[in-house]
Interface confidence: medium
Amino acid sequence: VVGVEEASVDSWPWQVSIQYDKQHVCGGSILDPHWVLTAAHCFRKHTDVFNWKVRAGSDKLGSFPSLAVAKIIIIEFNPMYPKDNDIALMKLQFPLTFSGTVRPICLPFFDEELTPATPLWIIGWGFTKQNGGKMSDILLQASVQVIDSTRCNADDAYQGEVTEKMMCAGIPEGGVDTCQGDSGGPLMYQSDQWHVVGIVSWGYGCGGPSTPGVYTKVSAYLNWIYNVWKAEL
C-alpha cells in the first residue's frame, strides 16, 4: 500500500496472507470458516493446491501459522481479456476458529452501488512505493475513495478498459494506492458492518494521479460466489 499508516490485525481480522512456498503472493479476505476471497491472477503461475498456504490472525507477515488449502476455484480465464473476472475463492482444508484477530468480512449487497467520493479502506503487505523493491513486513492501511468510472476511463487513464464489473479507487491527487503484493486483498466499505466491495486487481503503476487502483467489483460476482458455495456444500 502506498501513502500509508501501520495497521493492526484487530482492525482487519479478515485479512489473510496467501503464500506460495512460504512466500507472500497476495492478500485475501475471510468470508466464513472455510472460504477466503482473493484475485484470480494470484494463481496464474501456480495452480497446484499443495504449495499454497493461507496465514491468518497476525499483522506481521511471517509470524503466524499456515493453513492448508483444499481447493482454488477461479472463473474461466479469458486470454483475450486477461483483466476480466479477477476473482477466486480458496477453500481451506480445515475450518478457521474465529477469535478477536480472525473474523469474517461481509459480502456486499446485490444493489450496493457506491457513489464517487464514497470513503473506502485498503490494506496489505505490498510495496510501499512504485518499484519499491520489497514487501512490507507489517500490515499497512490507507483511506481512499471511489473514483468515478468515467474519470477512470478517460484518455489519460484507462481508456475504457475499466468495465462494469470493475471499480476504481484512490484519491484524486494520487499518492494513495494499492501496489504489488496487495493483490487479492479487500477494498472495504463501512456501513453498519464492514463489506468487501472490491478485490485488489490491477492498475498502471502505484499512486499515479490519473491511474488509480482498479478493483474487481464484488457485487457483480455474488451469484458466482453463492453458486460455488452451493456446489461445495
Epitope: 486470454p79 483475450m80 481479456y81 476480466d84 484518455d155 478498459e161 468495465t163 498502471y204
Partner: antibody
C-alpha cells in the same frame, strides 16, 4: 521485427483433420497471448481461438468449439491449431496473430499478423 | 450475421476526409480496434483502444467513439489507403471478439 511463419495448410476432405503451425520470431513469445483468425474466400474476418502466454488458458469461437484445439510450445516459439471434424464452411485463409500487450490496455486487439495459410475442405 | 455493422462500401476523393463507421451494442461498453486489409495481404492494425496508433501508422488515421458507434477517420486520404477496413470489439457476452463485415474504401 516480429515475424510469423505459417505451415500446415492444404486440401482436406470433410470430416478430416489438419494441424496448422505458426513459428514466431522477434517477439518474447511466452509474454504474449496468441490467436487464430480466419477469412473465408471473398468474406470478412472471423476470430477463431486464443491462448494465454503460458498456454494454460484457451478460448474458442462457438463455431469451432469442440472441434479445434489451440496450443503452443514456448520452447519452440510455435503456435498450433489442431482442426478435427472439418467442414466445408471451415474453408478459409487462417492467420495467426499476436495479441497486443499495451501496459494497461486489455489485449483484445491484434498487434501483428502472419501472412495466412489456405485450408480447403472439399471432397 | 454480424454483431458489428459496417457500410459495405465508401468512396472518397483523393486528399479529402472520410469517416468509416461501425455500429453495435457492445461499443457502448468497449472500444473498437480497426484493421486495414489490402488484396492478398494480411490485415494491419491501424487504431486500438480509444484512439491509439501503432508505430508506423500515419497520423491521418484517427478513431473516435460515441454511443454505440465507433468511427475511423482518414484525413487527407492517400491512394495507398484504398483497402477494406474492419472494426472489431468484444461481442455482447464480453467473452469473445467479433469483427464487422468490413468496409471497402475506394479512393477516387
Amino acid at each position: 521485427q516480429v515475424q510469423l511463419v505459417k505451415s500446415g495448410g492444404g486440401l482436406v476432405q470433410p470430416g478430416g483433420s489438419l494441424r496448422l503451425s505458426c513459428a514466431a520470431s522477434g517477439v518474447n513469445f511466452n509474454n504474449y497471448a496468441m490467436s487464430w483468425v480466419r477469412q473465408a474466400p471473398g468474406k470478412g474476418l472471423e476470430w477463431v481461438s486464443a491462448i494465454s502466454g503460458s498456454g494454460a488458458s484457451t478460448n474458442y469461437a462457438d463455431s469451432v468449439k469442440g472441434r479445434f484445439t489451440i496450443s503452443r510450445d514456448n520452447s519452440e516459439n510455435t503456435l498450433y491449431l489442431q482442426m478435427n471434424s472439418l467442414r466445408a464452411e471451415d474453408t478459409a485463409v487462417y492467420y495467426c496473430a499476436v495479441l497486443g500487450r499495451e501496459q494497461y490496455l486489455a489485449r483484445g486487439y491484434f498487434e501483428h499478423w502472419g501472412r495466412g495459410t489456405l485450408v480447403t475442405v472439399s471432397s | 450475421s454480424y454483431e458489428l455493422t459496417q457500410d459495405p462500401a465508401v468512396s472518397v476523393a483523393l486528399g479529402q476526409t472520410v469517416r468509416i463507421t461501425c455500429q453495435g451494442d457492445s461499443l457502448r461498453s468497449y472500444y473498437a480496434s480497426w484493421y486495414q486489409q489490402k488484396p492478398g495481404q494480411a490485415p494491419v492494425l491501424v487504431i486500438y483502444g480509444k484512439n491509439n496508433r501503432p508505430s508506423g501508422i500515419p497520423d491521418r488515421f484517427s478513431g473516435s467513439n460515441s454511443g454505440n458507434t465507433a468511427s475511423l477517420t482518414i484525413t487527407g486520404t492517400q491512394a495507398e489507403d484504398e483497402a477494406v477496413y474492419y472494426c472489431s470489439s468484444r461481442d455482447s457476452s464480453g467473452n469473445h471478439l467479433v469483427f464487422g463485415g468490413g468496409t471497402k474504401l475506394t479512393v477516387l
